[in-house]
């Protein structure tokens, strides 16, 4: 005979679950579907990931997201995790927001980002609900810098980047400082591929770095180079 009252708790149908912390009176729920829509927008050495919540929340409101990263070397096609070498704008696991920025990406590397949606019952199933997006980083190459000439009080410096990338650069920023002086530095901006740094001290080493400025922001910086002005004994404007 049917009982006069309903049961105090019901078994869940296949594919539905109660999390251990769920009260018996709570409806059965299931893991969410994958994030609905994922975009990866590259900006120099950064990528902004944005996604929309799953279309099916599984009947729960405790959805969190995890982002993982894989990088692939174009030459060999080999891939590997890149968590150790990139920086996230916030911890990439247990995210409640639907966007994150990933920075410190390497030029000419292919990245695949996976965004997984989870809720309180996701741990009770083996399947995962995720979406992936890939992006290639096309940040400008670091400029190759050369010392073209020097005098007792000046250094003439030139640089180059691959011709296909030159159209993306609107200016170059040259930063230089006296070696051993960490507190002050000078900055020169130019549209060309060379600059003469004047009013320098004789027989002194200067640290020089060149960075391309593009519409997306800063390109990769060159190496920090050490260039030395002539000593007064060897004066005259000598080409290197």
């Amino acid at each position: 005979l049917p009982s006069p009252e309903g049961a105090t708790s019901c078994e869940c149908e296949e594919g539905f679950f109660r999390a251990p912390q769920d009260p018996a009176s709570m409806p059965c729920t299931r893991p969410p579907s994958a994030p609905h829509y994922l975009t990866a927008v590259g900006m120099g050495a950064k990528v902004e990931l944005r996604w929309t919540p799953p279309q099916d929340s599984g009947g729960r409101e405790d959805i969190v997201y995890s982002v993982t990263c894989e990088q692939c070397w174009p030459e060999s096609g080999e891939c590997g995790p890149c968590e150790a070498s990139v920086r996230y704008s916030e911890p990439p696991h247990g995210l409640t927001r639907t966007s994150v920025t990933v920075s410190d990406l390497e030029p000419h590397m292919n990245y695949t980002f996976t965004v997984e949606a989870r809720n309180g019952v996701s741990g009770l199933v083996t399947s995962r609900s995720f979406r992936t997006a890939s992006v290639s980083i096309n940040q400008t190459e670091p400029p190759k810098v050369r010392l073209e000439g020097r005098s007792t009080t000046s250094l003439s410096v030139s640089w180059s980047i691959p011709p296909p990338q030159q159209s993306r650069v609107w200016k170059y920023e040259v930063t230089y400082r006296k070696k051993g002086d960490s507190n002050s530095y000078n900055v020169r901006r130019t549209e060309g591929f060379s600059v003469t740094l004047d009013d320098l001290a004789p027989d002194t080493t200067y640290l020089v770095q060149v960075q391309a400025l593009t519409q997306e922001g800063q390109g990769a910086g060159s190496k920090v180079h050490e260039f030395q002005t002539l000593s007064p004994e060897g004066s005259g404007n000598l080409a290197v």
Epitope: L147, K179, S182, H225, E226
Partner: antibody, heavy 130, light 108 residues
Framework: QVQLQQWGAGLLKPSETLSLTCAVY????????WSWIRQPPGKGLEWIGE??????????NYNPSLKSRVTISVDTSKNQFSLKLSSVTAADTAVYYC?????????????????????WGQGTMVTVAS | SYVLTQPPSVSVAPGQTARITCGGN??????VHWYQQKPGQAPVLVVY???DRPSGIPEQFSGSNSGNTATLTISRVEAGDEADYYC???????????FGGGTKLTVL
Amino acid sequence: QVQLQQWGAGLLKPSETLSLTCAVYGGSFSDYYWSWIRQPPGKGLEWIGEINHRGSINYNNYNPSLKSRVTISVDTSKNQFSLKLSSVTAADTAVYYCAKPLRPHCTNGVCYSGDAFDIWGQGTMVTVAS
Amino acid sequence: SYVLTQPPSVSVAPGQTARITCGGNNIGSKNVHWYQQKPGQAPVLVVYDDSDRPSGIPEQFSGSNSGNTATLTISRVEAGDEADYYCQVWDSSSDHVVFGGGTKLTVL
């Protein structure tokens, strides 16, 4: 081809002064910054400091963690440079290496501080124990 | 002071490719040098200036460097490559030489 040969006392008591010498055979002694590097047993490499002798001036540069106890000097007549580390403790037990950088320090205005080390001495194991 | 971070160990099967990383703030602006050290021996320079090889070093050793990570790649790994590997840079801010903590490469 430059070669480095080093020697010095291998067993010291705490508070004594470690003393090692490295002889440079071949190459231009004054063009390079010469370094000392050490490696405690089972651990990584630690740069101790460097010296360059140009004209009559010695240019020294030391690891800040050891600076108060380290002296690196040169004897240009013998193409040798030496390391002294005072007030040693058991923590100074290590293999000590002398090393030559790949390139002369400055060539035509282009300088290479902290260059790669392409030639190393054979290493001297120094033990500090009471 | 400037810090270089290496994984303590990397394992790889013979014939495969090993990648050893060296992490440091904006390391791409620095020249990175790599050494191989076998037990009881002095270190040997295998790559300098990020990707150049000294004479006598086989082309299976290569390097790259950008952003915050430099990488030493050893292709077609063989048993003789089992050793400790160290990265090194010059820190222009302090004018000091800095070594990474070292990575033990094990060939399975």
